[in-house]
């Protein structure tokens, strides 16, 4: 059974992940650049179901494409801290949260999403899990 300390750790990790995803989304929403149209044509795969931490496998599999799109966006008007480091940090959190005991085959929805829809989906996921922990 999860202890209060492990629950607290999970909550902190989810909050960290949530902040990172929100930072990316805010950067994109405030982004004024011709490359935005190009960014929005990039399709992200969404989970068919995302209700448990193990479903973060679906986020993990899309982190590389996310990094590529953010690399495309880098400019004077849109500057995240080093994209590689940011995605690497997210990846570490995701791996810890989902655990490595069982390797889940991610089941994707049929419908693809833009980067904005994708980030919003995982932000909502984090908020939902955090609310159940508090």
């Amino acid at each position: 059974a999860p202890t209060s300390s492990s629950t607290k750790k999970t909550q902190l990790q989810l909050e960290h992940l949530l902040l990172d995803l929100q930072m990316i989304l805010n950067g994109i929403n405030n982004y004024k650049n011709p490359k935005l149209t190009r960014m929005l044509t990039f399709k992200f795969y969404m989970p068919k179901k995302a209700t448990e931490l193990r479903h973060l496998q679906c986020l993990e599999e899309e982190l590389k494409p996310l990094e590529e799109v953010l690399n495309l966006a880098q400019s004077k008007s849109f500057h995240l801290r080093d994209t590689k480091d940011l995605i690497s940090n997210i990846n570490v959190i995701v791996l810890e949260l989902k655990g490595s005991e069982t390797t889940l085959m991610c089941e994707y929805a049929d419908e693809t999403a833009t980067i904005v829809e994708f980030l919003n989906r995982w932000i909502t996921f984090c908020q939902s899990i955090i609310s159940t922990l508090t």
Epitope: F42, K43, P65, E68, V69, E111, T112
Partner: antibody
Framework: QVQLQESGPGLVKPSQTLSLTCTVS??????????WNWIRQHPGKGLEWIGY???????HYNPSLKSRVTISVDTSKNQFSLKLSSVIAADTAVYYC???????????WGQGTMVTVSS | DIQMTQSPSSLSASVGDRVTITCRAS??????LNWYQQKPGKAPKVLIY???SFQSGVPSRFSGSGSGTDFTLTISSLQPEDFATYYC?????????FGQGTKVEIK
């Protein structure tokens, strides 16, 4: 200018495995955001997407073919490959490899290779 | 799977004619619709992506429009090199699917 070139046997016996390779020249298969696809076209018919691979090894297949398809990548050779098992006559088609950015439009295609399934 | 239905399946036209090809998706696909041209014995070539964006190097006589389920490819003034088969393709749903094609022939 990136170019794609398919290679492999033009004749495969029923129940065997069809194997094709696509060689990428003029650019790196590890270029960010690009996906490497296989698409086929049955004689005189329309186009059917088979699946893609990303340089990291992530794949996605058409559900209608998923049980028989394997796509792999060799970044050192700048190549990706298709294996289609248990082939039947209905798998006779022109097989194309194609590139897309962000799982969108297929912007660069190989010239295609005709594969006939026959004993 | 999303069904993509093109009409007409074939048409005859003369050089200089304005040609319109339509593509209908069985479900809404936003603006994730691409158009390709294919000549006999050749691979398809992308003309338009995201419903109305020009692929670089494509002549301006080609244009695309539409969103949701109904899309149109227009060739404003048909040229001899435009006689070919045209395909639409959706990229909003998995698997990506193509229309059955529209063959543009010389009248």
């Amino acid at each position: 200018q990136v170019q794609l070139q398919e290679s492999g046997p033009g004749l495969v016996k029923p129940s065997q495995t069809l194997s094709l390779t696509c060689t990428v020249s003029g650019g790196s298969i590890s270029s960010g955001g690009y996906y490497w696809n296989w698409i086929r076209q049955h004689p005189g018919k329309g186009l059917e997407w088979i699946g893609y691979i990303y340089y990291s090894g992530n794949t996605h297949y058409n559900p209608s073919l998923k049980s028989r398809v394997t796509i792999s990548v060799d970044t050192s050779k700048n190549q990706f490959s298709l294996k289609l098992s248990s082939v039947i006559a209905a798998d006779t088609a022109v097989y194309y490899c194609a590139r897309d950015w962000g799982r969108d439009a297929f912007d660069i295609w190989g010239q295609g290779t005709m594969v006939t399934v026959s004993s | 799977d999303i069904q993509m239905t093109q009409s007409p399946s074939s048409l005859s036209a003369s050089v200089g004619d304005r040609v319109t090809i339509t593509c209908r998706a069985s479900q809404t696909i936003s603006s994730y619709l691409n158009w390709y041209q294919q000549k006999p014995g050749k691979a398809p070539k992308v003309l338009i992506y995201a419903a109305s964006s020009f692929q670089s190097g494509v002549p301006s006589r080609f244009s695309g429009s539409g969103s949701g389920t109904d899309f149109t490819l227009t060739i404003s003034s048909l040229q001899p090199e435009d006689f070919a088969t045209y395909y639409c393709q959706q990229s909003h749903y998995i698997p990506r699917t193509f229309g059955q094609g529209t063959k543009v022939e010389i009248k």
